[in-house]
């Protein structure tokens, strides 16, 4: 701390604001009868550099100038940028216990002229907003700086305003606080930004502009969307404005897109009719405001207007598919399955579906409503049936689609040949067929249907189904299909009145199944053996498999055992081998394969056979 | 409500100076733009000089780089500082309190809602 300059003063030539790269000469007095006791001689000024606060030289050997006693110059150079703080010390050199004693200080700050402001740019929000401009104030000084914003217009009138920059706040922005009006619309306006420090001053260079050029107008607000009789794919959208906007831009997308609709309307004066919406669909929608056809800018965009069109009628077809299953000698039940419209056909929340079963003679009609995907009857075994199924919304239904209820795998001409699948990736596989070879009659359409290979799968979960055209010989299926699952794949060929199937397993993924089979028992039946077992759980299967293998070797021996192999079939589960010798004791267990290998062994029986053995 | 009072007028030199002040009295000084406005003998009243509630201020042209106006929310007083002074600002120069809004507005006697009772300046050459 500084005791206000008692014993003397502290002066800086040229000045205490210098450019950057210049010297300065500071110049320590003490005042009369100041000093060390009663001798002047003994009298020495030192001068102390502080940066923060923080000493960092003692310019002891910079003395350009020297009154020995009462005063002396020192010349400073290489100063940095920004503030530095010089204190001039009294050492009385004949004591030397004591510290020099504070005379006075010095603050030097170093720094640059301001260049030329540039990038000047002024804007107005919305008609009744004020006016703010902004720019670039170049490098930065170092100084206290001050700009002075001014504004000329027409009735010979300036407005200013000012604001500084210094190390604590940036100047780069001015408010006027002053309003543009519309009856300004043709005037030109001049603004400048000067700029002055203890260095030198600049000006930018003037920037002309019109009320139009400036006034961004306010979003829109207020907006609202009418549908005309309740449509849905049209409507009038409204908002407010204001006054003076001639040009709008309308932007609007369903919720969940990507891609927004523009539109442009000139002198909409708050209002503009869509005709393009989906019915039944979320819509976002936003305006936007511009006062001049081809300058000025546009406003901001509005809020977001979110709403959803009104329903109407489903349009498209169901995808209906069918299962037929005979109960006795004179009756079968047919389950009727169909997909779910996809959005932009049902246009509206389908309330229900109307299903009819009739008799192509006209005999006998079944009818009924569901909210459910599927429908199950118990219809006579006699006579042609045909099904039909709509949907329904609020505002009506769509066109009913007819399937011919066929023997789905009744002709064999109509099976198709050659069917494979192939796992794809993790989550598709590729079916492939050759079309039926002798067929009566020609292939209308080939449905591939699947269905996981699980307990109860048939009566529990619906099936899969796509439909190809009949020029089409490839299906890549993927709904629902999950890796380590083994599907069973039909292709069924449709002719106008029959139908033909081929049937083989698929996965996408396979892994060795986790464990083999369970032996559950051996019996001996006519000198063979009957081995009987339990189906690996579901779950452990871990894709298709392939076979299941039977090892058998003789108890305590060393040998590689012998091996029969069988074709897996889901409804066997038990399999006769003869090559073993009676009276001896043989241990047998069994695995399963997939295509990715074969399992660990299921567990161990023991089994002396009795008889005869071949 | 609000009174305004002016002082500092009378008669000086040409390339002399004066200030010209006005002592508001009102709570609410510090919500209105300030300004001066004069009339000459014969002439019509024109608008000279504001400062905002923001602190811009506007000047016409003809005393632009002459007149500083200035205000001081606390004491409730604005003042006009007239350097370089000419014949023809020879005028009674009226403080004004108001309200206008846009840069139109400000030049327009009829948007300032007081008035003081006028100073006289007189510059002779």
């Known amino acids: 701390n500084i005791d206000v300059c008692k014993l003397g003063t502290v002066t800086v030539q040229p000045a205490p604001v210098i450019p950057l790269g210049s010297a300065a000469n500071i110049s320590c007095s003490l005042n009369p009868k100041q000093g060390c006791s009663h001798y002047p001689s003994s009298n020495e000024l030192i001068l102390l550099k502080f940066v923060n606060d923080v000493l960092v030289e003692n310019l002891h050997g910079k003395k350009v100038h020297d009154h020995t006693g009462h005063s002396s110059t020192f010349q400073v150079t290489n100063l940095s940028l920004g503030m530095t703080l010089f204190v001039c010390k009294l050492n009385c050199s004949n004591s030397q216990k004591k510290p020099p004693v504070p005379v006075c200080g010095v603050e030097i700050s170093v720094g640059v002229a301001p260049e030329p402001p540039q990038n000047i740019s002024c804007v107005q929000e919305g008609e009744n907003g004020t006016v703010a401009c902004s720019w670039n104030s170049g490098k930065v000084t170092y100084l206290k700086t001050n700009y002075t914003l001014q504004l000329s217009g027409p009735n010979n009138l300036t407005c200013q305003k000012q604001c500084f920059s210094d190390n604590r706040q940036n100047c780069n922005r001015l408010d006027l606080g002053i309003n543009l009006s519309p009856d300004l619309a043709e005037s030109r306006f001049i603004v400048r930004v000067t700029a002055i420090n203890d260095l030198g001053n600049s000006s930018s260079l003037p920037h002309t502009f019109t009320f139009l050029d400036i006034v961004i107008p306010l979003p829109p607000w207020d907006i609202r969307i009418n549908f005309l009789n309740a449509s849905g794919s049209r409507g009038t959208l409204q908002w407010e404005d204001e006054g003076q906007v001639v040009l709008n831009q309308l932007r609007y997308q369903p919720l969940n897109s990507t891609s927004w609709n523009m539109v442009n309307a000139t002198n909409a004066k708050g209002k503009y009719d869509l005709r393009d919406l989906r019915p039944f669909t979320e819509y976002e929608f936003q305006i936007s405001s511009k006062l001049h056809l081809s300058g000025g800018s546009w406003s901001n965009w509005s809020e977001s207007l979110r709403t959803r069109t009104p329903e109407e009628e489903p349009v498209g077809i169901l995808d209906i598919w069918y299962m037929k299953q005979d109960i006795d000698y004179d009756r079968q039940q047919i389950s009727l399955f169909w997909k779910s419209l996809n959005p932009s056909e049902a246009r509206g929340k389908i309330l229900h579906y109307q299903v009819t079963l009739q008799e192509v003679t006209k005999k006998t009609t079944l009818q009924n409503t569901t909210r459910h995907t599927s429908w199950t009857r118990v219809i006579p075994r006699t006579g042609a049936w045909t099904a039909s199924v709509s949907a329904a919304n609020s505002k009506g239904a769509s066109a009913p689609t007819h399937i011919n209820i066929v023997d789905l795998c009744g002709t064999g001409l109509l099976a198709p040949h050659q069917v494979s699948a192939k796992s794809e990736n993790m989550d598709n596989i590729l079916v492939t067929w050759q079309p039926p070879k002798k067929a009566d009659s020609a292939v209308r359409e080939y449905i591939v249907e699947w269905r996981a290979l699980q307990p109860g799968s048939i009566t529990k979960f619906p099936p899969h189904w796509l439909r190809i055209p009949p020029d089409n010989m490839s299906a890549l299926i993927s709904e629902n299909i999950k890796p380590y699952i083994c599907y069973e794949i039909r292709v069924h060929a449709l002719s106008e009145s029959q139908g033909g199937c081929s049937s083989i397993r698929g996965d996408s993924k396979h892994k060795a199944p986790v464990s083999g089979p369970h032996i559950t028992a051996i019996t001996e039946k006519k000198e063979r053996l009957f081995i009987s077992w339990t189906h690996i759980p579901f779950p452990e299967q871990r894709g298709c498999i392939l076979h299941y293998r039977i090892y058998w070797k003789e108890r305590d021996s060393t040998a590689q055992p012998e091996l029969c192999e069988i074709q897996y079939r889901r409804s066997q589960n038990s399999h006769p081998i003869s090559s073993l010798q009676p009276r001896v004791t043989y241990v047998l267990w069994m695995t399963a394969v997939t295509a990715a290998g074969e399992s660990p062994q299921g567990n161990e029986r023991e089994f002396c056979p009795q008889g005869k053995a071949n | 409500q609000v009174q305004l009072q002016e002082s500092g007028g009378g008669l000086v030199q040409a390339g002399g100076s004066l200030r010209l002040s006005c002592a508001a009295s009102g709570r609410t000084f510090s919500n209105y733009a300030m300004g001066w406005f004069r009339q000459a003998p014969g002439k019509e009243r024109e608008f000279v000089a504001a400062?905002?509630?923001?602190?811009?201020?506007l000047y016409v042209d003809s005393v632009k780089g002459r007149f500083t106006i200035s205000r001081d929310n606390a004491k409730n007083t604005v003042a006009l500082q007239m350097n370089s002074l000419k014949p023809e600002d020879t005028a009674v120069y009226y403080c004004v309190a108001g309200m206008p809004f846009s840069y139109s507005d400000y030049p327009r006697d009829s948007k300032y809602d007081y008035w003081g009772q006028g100073t006289q300046v007189t510059v002779s050459s």
């Open positions: 400062i905002n509630r923001s602190g811009t201020t």
